[in-house]
Structures are given as structure tokens and as C-alpha cells.
């Protein structure tokens, strides 16, 4: 079954997907699509990379991480209820039946009418279970979506603020990771 991710209307949603290139710059094509992964490619493609660059994208969909290092996590800007559903991340690894496919379920909740409390800046205090979920296996690792009651948009925002820190690296490594080579 799909791993579930949540965001609120008006926020940015974050759907993690990672692989480890065999060598720096040795990229493989990746596609993101709305709908479960079909036999090949992605249905209703919203973003695509090739061996060098992002070669197709649609408005509101972008890669916030360093895709040249294998971070192909999708950010959906300013989500609406219509963005709910299954998304496919497909890593098109050369070879016989090597493609890696991840179906991620995005649930969009209506925006809270009550003002949000001041955001906690201490990452480990805000998400005490976060750093226990890291995985370094060669296949799919524990993902953020399996942790209950965590606002992934908030995590994504914090990750951006802490991009150069070790905590951000921990966050980035916690998504589905494929090592190639």
C-alpha cells in the first residue's frame, strides 16, 4: 500500500523520492506523475528529468533538492484539495526490469482557521522521533510518511532552513533511497 503524506490547503506539499547515482553526475531519467505507477513511464506526467537536467515540468511542481545528487523529491506549491491522490515517482534504471517505482498518497486537509502556534525552532524537540527513522539500506528505507501526526510541509520548510546542517542531511536521507551501481 502507498505511504501517506499530508499537507494543508495553501501550503507546499513534499513527496520524498531519492536514489544514489552510481557516480556524480551519472543520472538516470526520473518521472513524476499523478496516478499510480503504470507499466512504464508515469501517468499524467507533471515533471521529468533526463540524464542531465529537468526537461519537463508543469506549474507548481518542482524539485527543491539537488536532483544531481539523486534527490528527486517533489514539491507541489500552494496545494488545493484537488491535489489529493496518488503520485508516482519512477526511477528509470537501465537494465532488465530494474525500474524503481514508488506510489505516494497525498492527503490534503482544509486549512486550519485557528492561527498556528509559533513554530518550534529546535528540530529534535519539534520532531523527537525523526532521527530514529534513518535508513541506509540499498533498497527502500523508512519514510517520513509512516510517522503519524507530522506536518510534512513544516518538515520540508525546516529542511530548507537547515539545508547545510547535519539535521537536513538526516531528513534528506530518510526518504525512499535507491543506490545504483
Amino acid at each position: 500500500s502507498e505511504v501517506e503524506y499530508r499537507a494543508e490547503v495553501g501550503q507546499n506539499a513534499y513527496l520524498p523520492c531519492f536514489y544514489t547515482p552510481a557516480a556524480p553526475g551519472n543520472l538516470v531519467p526520473v518521472c513524476w506523475g499523478k496516478g499510480a505507477c503504470p507499466v512504464f513511464e508515469c501517468g499524467n506526467v507533471v515533471l521529468r528529468t533526463d540524464e542531465r537536467d529537468v526537461n519537463y515540468w508543469t506549474s507548481r511542481y518542482w524539485l527543491n533538492g539537488d536532483f544531481r545528487k539523486g534527490d528527486v523529491s517533489l514539491t507541489i506549491e500552494n496545494v488545493t484539495l484537488a491535489d489529493s491522490g496518488i503520485y508516482c515517482c519512477r526511477i528509470q534504471i537501465p537494465g532488465i526490469m530494474n525500474d524503481e517505482k514508488f506510489n505516494l498518497k497525498l492527503v490534503i486537509k482544509p486549512a486550519k482557521v485557528t492561527p498556528a502556534p509559533t513554530r518550534q525552532r529546535d528540530f529534535t524537540a519539534a520532531f523527537p522521533r525523526m532521527l530514529t527513522t534513518r535508513g541506509h539500506g540499498p533498497a527502500e528505507t523508512q519514510t517520513l510518511g509512516s510517522l503519524p501526526d507530522i506536518n510534512l510541509t513544516q518538515i520540508s520548510t525546516l529542511a530548507n532552513e537547515l539545508r547545510d546542517s547535519r539535521l537536513a542531511n538526516d531528513l534528506r536521507d530518510s526518504g525512499a533511497t535507491i543506490r545504483i551501481g
Epitope: V28, P29, G35, A36, P38, V39, F40, E41, G43, N44, V45, D50, E51, N55, Y56, Q92, I93, P94, G95, I96, M97, N98, D99
Partner: antibody, heavy 120, light 107 residues
């Protein structure tokens, strides 16, 4: 417009290897965006997907043929090929090569098909 | 593997009539279903992809509908060149599979 043409022997002996080539014209086989596939149709019967190789080098084989099947690309000749080993009479069919546009699947191109008979 | 069952096996109609062809999947294929037309001695021709989208160059009289397990191909008014065999194909799960076909013949 992409055009495809199958070529290969029309008669193969049992236990031998069936080899077919599909020559692509009107486009480069190495350019991104296409899946190069093989499908077959037994006489008077329906269609059976054999497998494909993608522009990125991903290869998928149908499980029932996987142990006997090889699909490969020769970019220098703008061709892709099918090799099916240890053939029997059950492999007698019209073999089609085809290309599928990966950018939305809204068009595909097929060869005219070639009949391969397995018989001694 | 996913089994696609097409009905009826044969449809006898006259030019100008409406043809309705059915395809049922043994499990959900979402909207990843295509329809092909095949005439004797010719390769299949893609008509519909993703259940309801007409392929490039396909006339508007061809339409597809459905999702999940039940799909329909409709030809609103049969032209003489439409008499052929029609196959559905699922692209949801490997291996790709085709239905057994529906032959649309002249009444």
C-alpha cells in the same frame, strides 16, 4: 514520422533461436521519448505483448518468455532486435515491432509485421 | 496477470449505427487502458489511451470511457472502414495484456 520495418527469417527450426530486427527510419532510436517494443499474434488469435526496451535502457520482458528472450538496441544501425531461444511450434506467429511515444502515450507506430513459422 | 474480458465477441451492425464495445478487467487498472483497431493483414492501430483520450489522428466518432475495471469503446456512427477487430489493452500492471477482441462485422 517514425516508420518501422521488421526483418528476419520466416522459417525457424524447433530448438533454434528466432532472431528478428526492426529498422527505424524517420527518427533516431537513441533520442529520448520512445519505448521500442515487440508484440506477437498467433495465427487467428489475439495479441501478446513480448517486451520493450526504453530510451533510457530499461528493459521489460513478459514473464512467460523471460527465460528465452533478449531485446537489445543497436544505435549505430538505428535498429532494435528480438532473440527468442529454444523455439517450438507454439512460437509460430506474426511478430510486430512498435514504438510508443512516452510523452503521454498519445501515438504509437507499428511495423507491418512478419510471419515466423517454427517447423522442421 | 490481469485478464481482460471483451464482450461481445462479435457485433453485427450496419453502417451509421452506434457500436458499444465492453472491456472488463479482472482487477483495477485505474485509467491505464488503451483500445486498438486491427484490420486483416494489418498491424494494430491505437485509438484510445488512458481510457478516454483519443490518439493522434483518430476521428471524433471514437470515444472511450470507464475506469477501474469496466471500460467502454463507443463508435457513434459506424463508417465502412470501421468494420474490424477491436482490442483493449491494460498498461497498469506488468505484463501488459490484451483482451480477446471484439469483431465488428457488417450486418
Amino acid at each position: 514520422q517514425v516508420q518501422l520495418q521488421e526483418s528476419g527469417p520466416g522459417l525457424v527450426k524447433p530448438s533454434q533461436t528466432l532472431s528478428l530486427t526492426c529498422t527505424v527510419s524517420g527518427g533516431s532510436i537513441s533520442s529520448g521519448g520512445y519505448y521500442w517494443s515487440w508484440t506477437r499474434q498467433h495465427p487467428g488469435m489475439g495479441l501478446e505483448w513480448i517486451g520493450y526496451i526504453s530510451y533510457s535502457g530499461s528493459i521489460y520482458y513478459t514473464p512467460s518468455l523471460k527465460s528465452r528472450l533478449t531485446i537489445s538496441v543497436d544505435t549505430s544501425k538505428n535498429q532494435f532486435s528480438l532473440k527468442l531461444s529454444s523455439v517450438t511450434a507454439a512460437d509460430t506467429a506474426v511478430y510486430y515491432c512498435a514504438s510508443l511515444d512516452s510523452w503521454g502515450s498519445n501515438r504509437d507506430y507499428w511495423g507491418q509485421g512478419t510471419l515466423v513459422t517454427v517447423s522442421s | 496477470e490481469i485478464v481482460l474480458t471483451q464482450s461481445p465477441a462479435t457485433l453485427s451492425l450496419s453502417p451509421g449505427e452506434r457500436a458499444t464495445l465492453s472491456c472488463r478487467a479482472s482487477q483495477s487498472v485505474s485509467s491505464y487502458l488503451a483500445w486498438y483497431q486491427q484490420k486483416p493483414g494489418q498491424a494494430p492501430r491505437l485509438l484510445i489511451y488512458d481510457a478516454s483520450n483519443r490518439a493522434t489522428g483518430i476521428p471524433a466518432r471514437f470515444s472511450g470511457s470507464g475506469s477501474g475495471t469496466d471500460f467502454t469503446l463507443t463508435i457513434s456512427s459506424l463508417e465502412p472502414e470501421d468494420f474490424a477487430v477491436y482490442y483493449c489493452q491494460q498498461r497498469s500492471n506488468w505484463p501488459l495484456t490484451f483482451g480477446g477482441g471484439t469483431k465488428v462485422e457488417i450486418k
